[in-house]
């Protein structure tokens, strides 16, 4: 699931999530994450994979929050 395109690059935090991924991304594939802008119509956590893909996820999913905690701790 891609985020809205941006002229400033694929990971610019002004992007919004319009749909969420329906599958759990393996933790080892994730390099970084960011939260979408609070002005977006729906919230989103964007995970950036080691291959450079941006994946929109639902912040209310437990695995998403678990990954965020893990990345904050490490």
């Amino acid at each position: 699931t891609k985020t809205e395109s941006s002229s400033r690059g694929p990971y610019h935090p002004s992007e919004c999530c319009f749909t969420y991924t329906t599958y759990k991304i393996p933790r080892q594939r994730i390099m970084d994450y960011y939260e979408t802008n609070s002005q977006c119509s729906k919230p989103g956590i964007v995970f950036i994979t080691k291959r450079g893909h941006s994946v929109c996820t639902n912040p209310s999913d437990k695995w998403v929050q678990d990954y965020i905690k893990d990345m904050k701790e490490n």
Epitope: T19, Y20, T22, E35, K42, N58, P59, S60, D61, K62, W63, Q65, D66, I68, K69, K72
Partner: antibody
Framework: QSVKESEGGLFKPADTLTLTCTVS????????INWVRQAPGEGLEYIGW???????YYASWAKSRSTITRNADENTVTLKMTSLTAADTATYFC???????????????WGQGTLVTVSS | AVVLTQTASPVSAPVGGTVTVKCQAS??????LAWYQQKQGQPPKLLIY???KLASGVPSRFKGSGSGTEYTLTIRGVECADAATYSC????????FGGGTEVVVK
């Protein structure tokens, strides 16, 4: 494990609503709290939630006038909603979940709810 | 946004009978659906999550099924205590609830 909402009451249009959810028997550091409301005779409506790490998220309709905060030391979560109108008349529930059901929106611990009436 | 349309109220069943409540989503929600029971003056009680999994402490006479956009809650061997309003919730997209279906037990 339980959650309880503070007293609601009668509000005037344009007032600001502040409700507090007090949790007992568990820590907010491992639980998320949702706010949901129900207008008389109507279905349930999600307002927003705060995660176990303290980040708040909102329904699109509520975002512009709602704020959810927490005090982990006192085990309380507060909902503040500004610019009330008659359409905000409802029973307001706080509900908790620890993610056991794979998603924090799925709540198995609910308060009894508190009635908020907005009328001039 | 997803819209959830439930079976119109009321739905009646005799004690010992079977009740079926349907919940139709306006788009696929990948089994991210929960069912709640709510009695008059009480908060909702979680019954089913992920479309078909029974929440802790819920009697096995409650069964959830479905996929894609069509979901069903079935109550077999209905008891007087099952008289309530049943609501579905999607948590795939925006955390939307259905309008509720009242079940009357005769």
């Amino acid at each position: 494990q339980s959650v309880k909402e503070s007293e609601g009451g009668l509000f005037k249009p344009a007032d600001t609503l502040t409700l507090t959810c007090t949790v007992s028997g568990f820590s907010l550091s491992s639980f998320a709290i949702n706010w949901v409301r129900q207008a008389p005779g109507e279905g349930l409506e999600y307002i927003g939630w705060i995660s176990d790490v303290g980040t708040a998220y909102y329904a699109s309709w509520a975002k512009s006038r709602s704020t959810i905060t927490r005090n982990a030391d006192e085990n309380t979560v507060t909902l503040k909603m500004t610019s009330l109108t008659a359409a905000d008349t409802a029973t307001y529930f706080c509900a908790g979940g620890d993610g056991s059901y794979s998603n924090y929106w799925v709540s198995d611990i609910w308060g009894q709810g508190t009635l908020v009436t907005v009328s001039s | 946004a997803v819209v959830l349309t439930q079976t119109a109220s009321p739905v009646s069943a005799p004690v010992g009978g079977t009740v079926t409540v349907k919940c139709q989503a306006s788009q696929t929600i990948n089994n991210r659906l929960a069912w709640y029971q709510q009695k008059q003056g009480q908060p909702p009680k979680l019954l089913i999550y992920e479309a078909s999994k029974l929440a802790s402490g819920v009697p096995s006479r409650f069964k959830g099924s479905g996929s894609g956009t069509e979901y069903t809650l079935t109550i077999r061997g209905v008891e007087c205590a099952d008289a309530a309003t049943y609501s579905c919730q999607e948590y795939a997209d925006e955390n939307i609830f259905g309008g509720g279906t009242e079940v009357v037990v005769k």
